[in-house]
C-alpha cells in the first residue's frame, strides 16, 4: 500500500548501555477528521491524545504492524521479520535496545472498510542511540520498585536529572493507557497499592530549529513489601525421622519459606551427615513453587536410586539461607518393620 | 471520614459566569483526582472533567472545552470549578466528586461526592 | 466519545424480585465499567468498580458482570431502598461517559 499519505511521528530512544530496557510504539491512528475509521478522543490542543483503539473494530488487535526497510525493498510484516518486537493489542514492545531497532514502522488497521481508510496509517520514524557518558549519571533507572504502603515516586528516566521547574511538559501512559493529568517529570504516588504496578511509559518533545520529536522511555514499575527481618523457615520435612523400604527409590523434598528481599539470593540444598564426616549432595535444581508479594516458597528434593542399609546410618540436612540467617533440618532413615 | 462540602445555590444571568467550590476533608487531598460532573433536571450524569489536585493539571470533556476552567488550593483543600459564558441549558446539579484510587490511576470509580450545587441561568 | 446504552430506561418490579440492567459500550472498554445508584434529590452512589467488584459497603445482593461491550447490573432480591435510578459509566478513556440510567419503581 501507499505510505505517503500516513501521518509520520518522529521518536527517540536513548538506552542505557549498562542497564537491560525496553521500548514501546503506540500505533497513533489519526483523527477522525482525516478518516472516519480512525477513533480518537476528542481533545483540546494542549491535551494529548489516548492511544487506543479505532472506529473500525472493538478488536484492539486489528492494527498491522510493517517496517520499511531502508534500501527501499516492500515493507516487511513485523511478526515476521523481527523475533525481538512483539505486538500486543495497539502496541509493539522491543525486548532488547540497539542502534538496529532504528528505522521507521509503520501501523495501520487490517481492515479497510472504505476508500478513506487507505491513508488511515502512521508512520514512526524511530532514532535509537546509546546514551552518552556526558548525559546525566544518575538518570532515573528503568525498573523502579514501589513500597506497598507507603510513599514513593516515578521519574522519567530522560528527565530525572532536570528539576520540575526546568522539565518540559510529560506526557505518561500506563499500560498503554493514557494517564491524562500526570504532567510532571516525576509522579509522586503518596501511598502505594498493588495497582501502582505496571509499565509507565513518559513522553516529551525536544526540538530544534528543523524539526521536533518525541523523547520516550519506558519504566517498569514494581510495587514490593519491604525486605523480610526473618530468615528462611522450612516448611517440610517437619518431621526428623522417616520409615522407608530398604532397596526401593526414595525421594525427600525440602520446602522453604523464604521472605521478600529486594536483592533476593536463596540458597537451598541437601547435605549428608556421616559420623565425622559431612558432605553436600548434587541434587536436581530448586524450583519455586509459590511466589507472592510478600514470600516464595522454594523446593528442592534429594533422590536415593535405592535405600540401602548405610543411608540408615546418615542424616540428610536440608539448609536454607537468605541474607538474614538460616535454618537446617535434618532427616534420620528408620526401616519400615512389617 | 471522608467528605466533600459545595458551595451553596446560585442564580445566573446568561452570558455570565460561575464559579463552584468543593471543600475536601478526612483524607490527603493530593492524593486523589477530582472529578466534575453534572445532571440538568430530569436529566442524566454528564462529566464534566477531572482536576489533579498536586499539580493542578486538568482534562476537560471536548464540549465545555474553552468555557470551563478547573483550579485547586492545596493549603485549604478546595477544588473549584467555574463555568462561562452561562447559557439556560447550564441550569443543573453540579457534583465534584472524589476519585476511588491513589494517583496516579485509572479511573476506577467516584467513590465519594459532594452534595451538589444548583446553578440556575435565567434572565 | 464512547457512547453509553443502557436498558431499560425504567422497570417496575416488586420487593424481593431478582432485577437485572444491562449497559452496552459502543466500543470494547475491557472492564472498565462503574455501576452508580442514584435516589432523588441526591448525590450518586458508588455500588460496582471494574465492571464486577463490589464496593466497599454495598449490600452482597448488588453484583456485575461482563466485560469487552456488554455488562450487567444485577440485584437478587429487590428491597424497599432499593428503588432508585441507577447509572453505568465507563472509565477506559476520556471522556469518562455515562448510560441514559435505568429507573427501579415499585410495582
Known amino acids: 500500500f501507499n505510505i505517503s499519505g500516513c501521518s509520520t511521528k518522529k521518536l527517540l530512544w536513548t538506552y542505557s548501555t549498562r542497564s537491560e530496557e525496553e521500548f514501546v510504539l503506540f500505533c497513533d491512528l489519526p483523527e477522525p477528521q482525516k478518516s472516519h475509521f480512525c477513533h480518537r478522543n476528542r481533545l483540546s490542543p494542549k491535551q494529548v491524545p489516548e492511544h487506543l483503539p479505532f472506529m473500525g473494530s472493538n478488536d484492539l488487535s486489528d492494527v498491522q504492524w510493517y517496517q520499511q526497510p531502508s534500501n527501499g525493498d516492500p515493507l516487511e510484516d513485523i511478526r515476521k521479520s523481527y523475533p525481538h518486537i512483539i505486538q500486543d493489542k495497539c502496541t509493539l514492545h522491543f525486548l532488547t535496545p540497539g542502534v538496529n531497532n532504528s528505522g521507521s514502522y509503520i501501523c495501520r488497521p487490517k481492515m479497510i472498510k472504505s476508500p478513506y481508510d487507505v491513508a488511515c496509517c502512521v508512520k514512526m520514524i524511530l532514532e535509537v542511540k546509546p546514551q552518552t557518558n556526558a548525559s546525566c549519571e544518575y538518570s532515573a533507572s528503568h525498573k523502579q520498585d514501589l513500597l506497598l504502603g507507603s510513599t514513593g515516586s516515578i521519574s522519567c528516566p530522560s528527565l530525572s536529572c532536570q528539576s520540575d521547574a526546568q522539565s518540559p511538559a510529560v506526557t505518561w501512559y500506563k499500560n498503554g493507557k493514557l494517564l491524562s493529568v500526570e504532567r510532571s517529570n516525576r509522579i509522586v504516588v503518596d501511598e502505594v497499592y498493588d495497582y501502582h504496578q505496571g509499565t509507565y511509559v513518559c513522553d516529551y518533545t525536544q526540538s530544534d530549529t528543523v524539526s521536533s520529536w518525541t523523547v520516550r522511555a519506558v519504566v517498569q514499575v514494581r510495587t514490593i513489601v519491604g525486605d523480610t527481618k526473618l530468615k528462611p523457615d522450612i516448611l517440610d520435612p517437619v518431621e526428623d525421622t522417616l520409615e522407608v523400604e530398604l532397596g526401593k527409590p526414595l525421594t525427600i523434598s525440602c520446602k522453604a519459606r523464604f521472605g521478600f528481599e529486594r536483592v533476593f539470593n536463596p540458597v537451598i540444598k541437601w547435605y549428608i551427615k556421616d559420623s565425622d564426616l559431612e558432605w553436600e549432595v548434587s541434587v536436581p535444581e530448586a524450583k519455586s513453587i509459590k511466589s507472592t508479594l510478600k514470600d516464595e516458597i522454594i523446593e528442592r528434593n534429594i533422590i536415593l536410586e535405592k535405600v540401602t542399609q548405610r543411608d540408615l546410618r546418615r542424616k540428610f540436612v536440608c539448609f536454607v539461607q537468605n541474607s538474614i540467617g538460616n535454618t537446617t533440618q535434618s532427616v534420620q532413615l528408620k526401616e519400615k518393620r512389617g | 471520614q471522608v467528605q466533600l462540602v459545595q458551595s451553596g445555590a446560585e442564580v445566573k444571568k446568561p452570558g455570565a459566569s460561575v464559579k463552584v467550590s468543593c471543600k475536601a476533608s478526612?483524607?490527603?487531598?493530593?492524593?486523589?483526582?477530582m472529578h466534575w460532573v453534572r445532571q440538568a433536571p430530569g436529566q442524566g450524569l454528564e462529566w464534566m472533567g477531572i482536576?489533579?489536585?498536586?499539580?493542578?493539571?486538568?482534562t476537560y470533556a471536548q464540549k465545555f472545552q474553552g468555557r470551563v476552567t478547573m483550579t485547586r488550593d492545596t493549603s485549604t483543600s478546595t477544588v473549584y470549578m467555574e463555568l462561562s459564558s452561562l447559557r439556560s441549558e447550564d441550569t443543573a446539579v453540579y457534583y465534584c466528586?472524589?476519585?476511588?484510587?491513589?494517583?496516579?490511576?485509572?479511573?476506577?470509580?467516584?467513590?465519594?461526592w459532594g452534595q451538589g450545587t444548583t446553578v440556575t441561568v435565567s434572565s | 466519545d464512547i457512547q453509553m446504552t443502557q436498558s431499560p430506561s425504567s422497570l417496575s418490579a416488586s420487593v424481593g424480585d431478582r432485577v437485572t440492567i444491562t449497559c452496552r459500550a459502543s466500543?470494547?472498554?475491557?472492564?472498565?465499567l462503574n455501576w452508580y445508584q442514584q435516589k432523588p434529590g441526591k448525590a450518586p452512589k458508588l455500588l460496582i468498580y471494574?465492571?464486577?467488584s463490589l464496593q466497599s459497603g454495598v449490600p452482597s445482593r448488588f453484583s456485575g458482570s461482563g466485560s469487552g461491550t456488554d455488562f450487567t447490573l444485577t440485584i437478587s432480591s429487590l428491597q424497599p431502598e432499593d428503588f432508585a435510578t441507577y447509572y453505568c459509566?465507563?472509565?477506559?478513556?476520556?471522556?469518562?461517559?455515562f448510560g441514559g440510567g435505568t429507573k427501579v419503581e415499585i410495582k
Open positions: 466500543q470494547s472498554i475491557s472492564s472498565y
Open positions: 482536576i489533579n489536585p498536586r499539580g493542578g493539571y486538568t
Open positions: 471494574d465492571a464486577s
Open positions: 478526612g483524607y490527603t487531598f493530593t492524593s486523589y483526582y
Open positions: 466528586a472524589k476519585e476511588g484510587r491513589v494517583s496516579p490511576t485509572d479511573y476506577y470509580g467516584m467513590d465519594v
Open positions: 459509566q465507563q472509565s477506559y478513556s476520556t471522556p469518562l461517559t
